[in-house]
Amino acid sequence: HNTTVFQGVAGQSLQVSCPYDSMKHWGRRKAWCRQLGEKGPCQRVVSTHNLWLLSFLRRWNGSTAITDDTLGGTLTITLRNLQPHDAGLYQCQSLHGSEADTLRKVLVEVLADPLDHRDAGDLWFPGESESFEDAHVEHSISRSLLEGEIPFPPTS
């Protein structure tokens, strides 16, 4: 699986979409999980409704929501109030029994928001105390991870 990058802005909402073959995955519940380390397990964050026919109903776990368009074949995950610690590698999964198929590998990147400085503490190096002026910027879109790019963002 290629990794798709979704960039979101801190404090804003990010929508991640995972397309799939609706016939192949007919009747299957879906899940969104966070990869723990490069080869570690994928820790489930949220899954669709226990009744597959009700998969279109949005389910929340904290600030993360999931909803499934089972006819159109699109799983949508919404991350509300995105924070730097949300950055990392995730998976969209299709569940069958105790098994899980990966629909898409997703790298979430969290960008600073130049227009909203309510959480400005992380913008400057320690020791710097500079005033913010007035302001700009975007939304939730994706691209494929280029060859050679690191799937895990460096820690600071």
Partner: antibody
């Protein structure tokens, strides 16, 4: 192909009002964050306003110099973003560009319209 | 941002270095990115994005354009200037408050 087309510019007296429109095509407009940036010989390029997408509650942001006078809005059904400008001043004169942040990467102005000239003069 | 020089007369084939200095660091430690872009504006046209994140060349931009720098000091280098490169070049920081430099005008000698 992404296209942004501004309209509504022209000559207006100080204190007057004007509404600019920008119609977009070639991308999913409802997903995009849309901005207005203006350019004048005196001030160069200057960011004016931004409106975000539905997921982000169509949040709006303004430059200090236009706050309280300008209003940015959008109509996703028409793929159009607007800039309502009231209490215009001579220093608001310039070319107004509509820009979009929709292209897979955030935070920089990847797409620009051709611009529409606004002249505020007595 | 402060751009220098304000104008520059060059000959075709020459190597050119344009400078942009920011009063505040535009580096965001959380994702290790410099929030700086470069735009090219030809007469009668709207600005065109060349470089984002200080060094990422946009699709379709010739490889003679290179962005570099970190924190507060940034450079746009054109390795061998062509006639079609004559334009005004602007830097733009998008970390805190959307601001643009005053531009550097590239002219023919």
């Amino acid at each position: 192909e992404v296209k942004l087309e501004e309209s509504g510019g022209g000559l207006v007296q100080p204190g007057g009002s004007m509404k600019l429109s920008c119609t977009a095509s070639g991308f999913t407009f409802s997903d995009a964050w849309m901005d207005w940036v203006r350019q004048s010989p005196e001030k160069g390029l200057e960011w004016v306003a931004e409106i975000r997408n539905k997921v982000n509650n169509h949040a709006t942001y303004y430059a200090e110099s236009v706050k309280g006078r300008f209003t940015i809005s959008r109509d996703d059904s028409k793929s159009t973003v607007y800039l309502q400008m009231n209490s215009l001043r001579t220093e608001d004169t310039g070319i107004y560009y509509c820009t979009s942040l929709y292209d897979g990467y955030y935070l920089r102005f990847a797409y620009w319209g051709q611009g529409t000239l606004v002249t505020v003069s007595a | 941002q402060t751009q220098s020089p304000s104008s520059l007369a060059v000959s075709a084939g020459e190597k050119v270095t344009l400078s942009c200095k920011s009063s505040q660091s535009v580096f965001y430690s959380s994702n290790q990115k410099n929030y700086l872009a470069w735009y090219q504006q030809k007469p009668g046209q709207s600005p065109k994005l060349l470089i984002s994140w200080a060094s990422t060349r946009e699709s379709g931009v010739p490889d003679r354009f290179t962005g570099s720098g970190f924190g507060t000091d940034f450079t746009l280098t054109i390795s061998s200037v062509q006639g079609e490169d004559l334009a005004v070049y602007y830097c733009h920081q998008y970390l805190s408050s959307l601001t643009f430099g005053a531009g550097t005008k590239l002219e023919l000698k």
